[in-house]
């Protein structure tokens, strides 16, 4: 058993049929010595008396808010949550496996630049009685500060018969140098509580590996005289690290119709312009990637050919 | 400790091409090592990230773009002095700081070159003959060092009398390649910045 926060405790349980569970001793936070009784949740049934209460925690029915009273007055609360371990593996029932970039990916994180700011998100099908708390640091043995905001519901989607909820959080490394060479990874830890179930999820990464630039901005077309060719130009996204001559991007320019299976023109360039062949009912799209360290491509920025 | 904006003419900067070749060569070598040593801990997640140049050179700080010198987090207190007669400078106006930056890069290359050569000598003794260092990568390091053209004491190649532990050597190769790739990225960014300035 360990304390998650004030008056909230996590009981770690090996979860299998007829498991003995964990013996837990609760102590009432009061100077009083006698006349103390204990109840669980909304029930008025007295579970025991005295300053301490010993319970055997085996299942979710044994978890919940234990309250000690004296003469009708509440003295203190202790909320017990359960953390299940099945076959030596901690449960991951609350969050959905995103399976990208690999199996057992529950948290995904991205950074728009090298400033030390990043966003992480996760998915769940649970809609109520759900809370998240996020902590982060650079390194684990001698952790350096990363400040994370509160996790918020950022999107709702319908997937078949189920609704899927996306939560996200923004974090900022306290003292980040965009040009620094990372040797210690960022660690992100998410505590998830659904009703009386506790789970924790972690992710470890270097900012350089989660870089995904914003799409290029200000796409413009200039038809070339006596030619089907069009000069397309664009600019670096505002959110990208500066100076751009140091933090350079490379670009992919593509002309394609509405269907992915349609024929296309595609060219890669380090410049902020390119010449492509435009077709009727097609779009010109441009995306960006760090020129020197190949992490993710940005989303496409598009303009119609016509 | 930072790069000035007024530096060489874009066409006068011979090191940019060499630094691009360097990044390409080390990336290819790292990819080859990951594939060949698939049953060794050789991915970024599996290895310890060590920097053999730590406390010996200060390339990131010495080569910091002017625009980042306002960022407190980028200003490290480490100071290192270097010889300043590089041929990549290509301009009389080149400042002492830029010379410091380029000589720091030269020192990095020299240290990695020694490590890689020592390691290759060990790998050549491996009866499995599983992996060797790409000669192209060693040649590219040499070319960039020649283009930088700094005079500096030659570092003797480390020789070891004890029987090499090939497992450890291969893991060390992975660690070294990961670190060198990160440094090659920095070098490429620096050269690109200097070329554009």
């Amino acid at each position: 058993i360990w304390e998650l926060k004030k008056d909230v405790y996590v009981v770690e349980l090996d979860w299998y049929p007829d498991a003995p569970g964990e013996m837990v001793v609760l102590t009432c936070d009061t100077p009083e010595e006698d006349g103390i009784t204990w109840t669980l949740d909304q029930s008025s049934e007295v579970l025991g008396s005295g300053k301490t209460l010993t319970i055997q925690v085996k299942e979710f029915g044994d978890a919940g808010q234990y309250t000690c009273h004296k003469g009708g007055e509440v003295l203190s609360h202790s909320l017990l949550l359960l953390h299940k371990k099945e076959d030596g593996i901690w449960s991951t029932d609350i969050l959905k496996d995103q399976k990208e970039p690999k199996n057992k990916t529950f948290l995904r994180c991205e950074a728009k630049n090298y400033s030390g700011r990043f966003t992480c998100w996760w998915l769940t099908t649970i809609s109520t009685d759900l809370t998240f708390s996020v902590k982060s640091s650079r390194g684990s043995s001698d952790p350096q500060g990363v400040t994370c905001g509160a996790a918020t519901l950022s999107a709702e989607r319908v997937r078949g018969d189920n609704k899927e909820y996306e939560y996200s959080v923004e974090c900022q490394e306290d003292s980040a140098c965009p040009a620094a060479e990372e040797s210690l990874p960022i660690e992100v830890m998410v505590d998830a509580v659904h009703k009386l179930k506790y789970e924790n999820y972690t992710s470890s990464f270097f900012i350089r590996d989660i870089i995904k630039p914003d799409p290029p901005k200000n796409l413009q077309l200039k038809p070339l005289k006596n030619s089907r060719q069009v000069e397309v130009s664009w600019e670096y996204p505002d959110t990208w690290s500066t100076p751009h001559s140091y933090f350079s991007l490379t670009f992919c320019v593509q002309v394609q119709g509405k269907s992915k299976r349609e024929k296309k023109d595609r060219v890669f360039t380090d410049k902020t312009s390119a010449t492509v062949i435009c077709r009727k009912n097609a779009s010109i799209s441009v995306r960006a990637q760090d020129r020197y360290y190949s992490s993710s491509w940005s989303e496409w920025a598009s303009v119609p050919c016509s | 400790r930072n790069l000035p904006v007024a530096t060489p003419d874009p066409g006068m900067f011979p090191c940019l091409h060499h630094s691009q070749n360097l990044l390409r060569a080390v990336s290819n070598m790292l990819q080859k090592a990951r594939q060949t040593l698939e049953f060794y801990p050789c991915t970024s997640e599996e290895i310890d990230h060590e920097d053999i140049t730590k406390d010996k050179t200060s390339t990131v700080e010495a080569c910091l773009p002017l625009e980042l010198t306002k960022n407190e987090s980028c200003l490290n207190s480490r100071e290192t002095s270097f010889i300043t007669n590089g041929s990549c400078l290509a301009s009389r106006k080149t400042s002492f700081m830029m010379a410091l930056c380029l000589s720091s890069i030269y020192e990095d290359l020299k240290m990695y070159q020694v490590e890689f050569k020592t390691m290759n000598a060990k790998l050549l003794m491996d009866p499995k003959r599983q992996i060797f260092l790409d000669q192209n990568m060693l040649a590219v390091i040499d070319e960039l060092m020649q283009a930088l053209n700094f005079n500096s004491e030659t570092v003797p190649q480390k020789s070891s009398l004890e029987e090499p532990d090939f497992y450890k050597t291969k893991i060390k190769l992975c660690i070294l390649l990961h670190a060198f790739r990160i440094r090659a990225v920095t070098i490429d960014r620096v050269m690109s910045y200097l070329n554009a300035s």
Epitope: R228, Q229, T250, R261, E262, K263, K264, D265, R266, V267, F268, T269, D270, T275, I277, R279, K280 | -
Partner: antibody, heavy 118, light 107 residues
Framework: QVQLVQSGAEVKKPGSSVKVSCKAS????????LHWVRQAPGQGLEWMGW????????EYAPKFQGRVTITADESTSTAYMELSSLRSEDTAVYYC???????????AGQGTLVTVSS | DIVMTQSPLSLPVTPGEPASISCRAS??????LHWYQQKPGQAPRLLIY???QSISGVPSRFSGSGSGTDFTLTISSLQPEDFATYYC?????????FGQGTKVEIK
């Protein structure tokens, strides 16, 4: 399976024209760009131009501009390359090639040898 | 026009040994570079597109690398069927241009 079948070998006199055909099978004809590339005996490859069979758009290499015409007939899934004012240096194997990507080719025909000789 | 220069023009190799072919562009072409294999009397066959992307059906011993002006096609261990002529082609701008070809022959 995508296939491109070209017309047979031709012998032509200098100053005349030649029209080589390329019939496509497998896949929708207009879903691909079609290129013509030639190769003189013992020499390398030389790109001549492309056509978009969907709309008839063409682009030619400056070297052949004014002498080459590439056309396509969607109804028969056939592309044609006509080269006029033939000279001896036009003696070559002419290949048609196609791809969904405009700037390179993933399937080519078997080639048509055009010999220009007086 | 962008000029593509291949080297060497002839490459004698022992079967089972690796082979590398170089292709240099007269100006930077990013990764707009493709490799073809051609055997006598046959049409060119695409091996690698956009400098390093492999084609399904092409043996994994063929790999490509490079960007900017310098590119390499590597055959990790030459098989008897790999003896052929190899061409690089740039797609950075029209007209599309090819290298002169490198003939890989049995040593």
């Amino acid at each position: 399976q995508v296939q491109l079948v070209q017309s047979g070998a031709e012998v032509k006199k200098p100053g005349s024209s030649v029209k080589v055909s390329c019939k496509a099978s497998g896949g929708t004809f207009s879903d691909y760009y079609l290129h013509w590339v030639r190769q003189a005996p013992g020499q390398g490859l030389e790109w001549m131009g492309w056509i978009d069979p969907e709309n008839g758009d063409t682009e030619y290499a400056p070297k052949f501009q004014g002498r080459v015409t590439i056309t396509a007939d969607e109804s028969t899934s056939t592309a044609y390359m006509e080269l006029s004012s033939l000279r001896s240096e036009d003696t070559a194997v002419y290949y048609c090639a196609r791809n969904k990507e405009l700037r390179y080719f993933d399937v080519a025909g078997q080639g048509t040898l055009v010999t220009v000789s007086s | 026009d962008i000029v593509m220069t291949q080297s060497p023009l002839s490459l004698p190799v022992t079967p089972g040994e690796p082979a590398s072919i170089s292709c240099r562009a007269s100006q930077s072409i990013s990764i707009n570079l493709h490799w073809y294999q051609q055997k006598p009397g046959q049409a060119p066959r695409l091996l690698i597109y956009f400098a390093s992307q492999s084609i399904s059906g092409v043996p994994s011993r063929f790999s490509g690398s490079g960007s900017g002006t310098d590119f390499t096609l590597t055959i990790s261990s030459l098989q008897p069927e790999d003896f052929a002529t190899y061409y690089c082609q740039q797609s950075n701008s029209f007209p599309l241009t090819f290298g002169q070809g490198t003939k890989v022959e049995i040593k």
